[in-house]
Interface confidence: low
């Protein structure tokens, strides 16, 4: 108990909790927040901010807590059963295909366009054409003509769990 | 350059109270859990403390715990360690050093300088 | 709290040696094993991190091996600037624990 951590954010029966509870596995498998002892006899709790496991499981180790990269903001810390919850800062979006980096939403839209959709956590501006309504993605190459406009508020948490 | 330097050592009594500034240059502070060790005169290393990036997760030493305080200014690019009832077993050189690519799995990189604390009466 | 036990203490080599020196850890730390190295009166300098992943501007002749608890550091060819104490330090879990050291002296 000689690690015990000293988390500010939380409750104060949660700061108090040993680092390591042992039990017993229930067929074989131990409860999330926990891991299963080399012999397979116990059931071994993670530690808080440390690592993790979600799911009923009989792993040898917990899963190592996520440290949110430069460009985010934690929206939510490491718990022995949930792994840290990340999300890009404000003005910066993270897309499907390049999950590793959060990327930086365009300003505006090339001209002929209108912005419909604000910059998320998880996209970026959407921009129609004025005529047609054709969706694109704020992306625009260099040379465009943009109009600025601010980015918007993001309206729900966007979770990386890496 | 990334670079680290301490500050805030001096002769100090023992009972006596003492805060160490670690002053970071060179990235970007706010990203980085940080930490201090300590090395007492022709010893080896010992861990003292560790703080995340946003101060939400802080760890000690069983053998500073409740007398040192660390903590962190983003704002700043600044680390303290606020260190009370000093014992002449805390006499040592204090690092300041950077935490690694995790929160959890960390290593220490790169060092300051150290600022040399001493408890005597 | 997981013991970090160094060996041997010092080690008296000559400059193109081949020098190997041994961490073992108490516990299992997987690959979460860090090697320093310190001179006289200078901060430690980070050589190894993750067991065997050679810091950026360490010279190859450095190389880290090792998994579970039994790790090794070995200076291929000695240089005379790699005279200098060795540390191993465990990232595994708090708190964070080094070796006692490992001074490489000339013989």
């Known amino acids: 108990e000689s690690a015990l951590i000293t988390q500010q954010d939380l409750a104060p029966q949660q700061r108090a909790a040993p680092q390591q509870k042992r039990s017993s596995p229930s067929e074989g498998l131990c409860p999330p927040g926990h891991h299963i002892s080399e012999d397979g006899r116990d059931c071994i709790s993670c530690k808080y901010g440390q690592d993790y496991s979600t799911h009923w499981n009989d792993l040898l180790f917990c899963l190592r807590c996520t440290r949110c990269d430069s460009g985010e903001v934690e929206l939510s810390p490491c718990t022995t059963t949930r792994n840290t919850v990340c999300q890009c800062e404000e003005g910066t979006f993270r897309e499907e295909d390049s999950p590793e980096m959060c990327r930086k939403c365009r300003t505006g839209c090339p001209r002929g366009m209108v912005k419909v959709g604000d910059c998320t956590p998880w996209s970026d501006i959407e921009c129609v054409h004025k005529e047609s309504g054709t969706k694109h993605s704020g992306e625009v190459p260099a040379v465009e003509e943009t109009v600025t406009s601010s980015p918007g508020t993001p309206a729900s948490p966007c979770s990386l769990s890496g | 350059e990334v670079q680290v330097v301490e500050s805030g050592g001096g002769l100090v009594k023992p009972g006596g109270s003492l805060r160490l500034s670690c002053a970071a240059s060179?990235?970007?502070?706010?990203?980085?859990?940080m930490n201090w060790v300590r090395q007492a005169p022709g010893k080896g290393l010992e861990w003292v403390s560790s703080i995340s990036s946003s101060s939400s997760y802080i760890y000690y030493a069983d053998s500073v715990k409740g007398r040192f305080t660390i903590s962190r200014d983003n704002a700043k690019n600044s680390l303290y360690l606020q260190m009370n009832s000093l014992r002449a077993e805390d006499t040592a050189v204090y690092y300041c050093?950077?935490?690694?690519?995790?929160?959890?799995?960390?290593?220490?990189?790169?060092w300051g300088q150290g600022t040399l604390v001493t408890v005597s009466s | 709290d997981i013991q970090m036990t160094q060996s041997p203490s010092s080690v008296s080599a000559s400059v193109g040696d081949r020098v190997t020196i041994t961490c073992r850890a108490s516990?299992?730390?997987?690959?979460?094993l860090v090697w320093y190295q310190q001179k006289p009166g200078k901060a430690p300098k980070l050589l190894i991190y993750a067991a065997s992943s050679l810091q950026s501007g360490v010279p190859s002749r450095f190389s880290g091996s090792g998994s579970g608890t039994d790790f090794t550091l070995t200076i291929s060819s000695l240089q005379p600037e790699d005279f200098a104490t060795y540390y191993c330090?465990?990232?595994?879990?708090?708190?964070?624990?080094f070796g006692g050291g490992t001074k490489v002296e000339i013989k």
């Open positions: 050093a950077r935490g690694g690519s995790s929160w959890y799995g960390d290593w220490f990189d790169p």
């Open positions: 516990q299992g730390i997987s690959s979460w």
């Open positions: 330090q465990q990232a595994n879990s708090f708190p964070f624990t």
């Open positions: 060179g990235f970007t502070f706010s990203s980085y859990s």
